[in-house]
């Protein structure tokens, strides 16, 4: 099996969960 390492250039050491809804629901069909 392979192993790879990724490094982000973002300087913050705390992952930001702010890009995702806190209590998401499923998309409704229109």
């Amino acid at each position: 099996s392979e192993t790879t390492t990724g490094t982000s250039s973002n300087s913050s050491q705390s992952t930001s969960n702010s890009g995702l809804a806190p209590n998401p629901t499923n998309a409704t069909t229109k």
């Epitope: 973002n10 992952t15 930001s16 969960n17 995702l20 806190p22 629901t25 998309a27």
Partner: antibody
Framework: EVKFEESGGGLVQPGGSIKLSCAAS????????MDWVRQSPEKGLEWVAE??????????YYAESVKGRFTISRDDSKGRVYLQMNNLRTEDTGIYYC??????WGQGTSVTVSS | DIVMTQTPLSLSVTIGQPASISCKSS???????????LNWLQQRPGQSPKRLIY???KLDPGIPDRFSGSGSETDFTLKISRVEAEDLGIYYC?????????FGGGTKLEIK
């Protein structure tokens, strides 16, 4: 320095199983919502699964295409998130990225499902 | 599922010139808390994606202010005020309002 190190990828036959692992360092892992996202030439970027933190009771979410076949889990004491992939299909082939809520990303590990 | 449609598919820009990418969602991405969970990601050749912008217009740490995001509801735009050589790659919009999270098909930025 934030690093996400993925491992476990490889070649597997249709119907087979594989377990991916992602080790995080340099980040407050226990607070992170962790996702697996895959990428293929056919489907582009495709979200697979997510596990939230203790404050969210480690709730999990899955894409419909993997529900019942894949299981996401985490070990906060080790700073690791896992993706157990069962009953694999050829369409599961791709590069699997571990990401902290789309913020930090690993370099990806390749999974090929083929006979 | 929410469909994210990006235009153009590709664009070629001279260094120092501006660039603009459009992203349209099939439903409003406005969440009940008043926030809109629209992200922009950059993927340089041979690299993994990197988030540039979250919640429509908020820049991630370390991202140059040449990048900016705008829009609301279903129509969003990523702008680069002055393109630099390091900006080449594929840009994706991604929505985090409704499950499943979905991505646009990408816009390839080439340097003239």
């Amino acid at each position: 320095e934030v690093k996400f190190e993925e491992s476990g990828g490889g070649l597997v036959q249709p119907g087979g199983s594989i377990k991916l692992s992602c080790a995080a360092s340099g980040v407050t892992f226990s607070e992170a919502w962790m996702d697996w996202v895959r990428q293929s030439p056919e489907k582009g970027l495709e979200w697979v699964a997510e596990i939230r933190d203790k404050t969210k009771n480690y709730v999990t979410y899955y894409a419909e295409s993997v529900k019942g076949r894949f299981t996401i889990s985490r070990d906060d004491s080790k700073g690791r998130v896992y993706l157990q992939m069962n009953n694999l299909r050829t369409e599961d082939t791709g590069i699997y990225y571990c990401t902290g809520a789309m913020d930090y990303w690993g370099q990806g590990t390749s999974v090929t499902v083929s006979s | 599922d929410i469909v994210m449609t990006q235009t153009p598919l590709s664009l070629s820009v001279t260094i120092g010139q501006p660039a603009s990418i459009s992203c349209k969602s099939s439903q409003s991405l406005l969440y009940s808390n008043g926030k809109t969970y629209l992200n922009w990601l950059q993927q340089r050749p041979g690299q993994s994606p990197k988030r540039l912008i979250y919640q429509v217009s908020k820049l991630d740490p370390g991202i140059p202010d040449r990048f900016s995001g705008s829009g609301s509801e279903t129509d969003f735009t990523l702008k680069i005020s002055r393109v630099e050589a390091e900006d080449l790659g594929i840009y994706y919009c991604m929505q985090g309002t409704y499950l499943p999270w979905t991505f646009g098909g990408g816009t390839k930025l080439e340097i003239k």
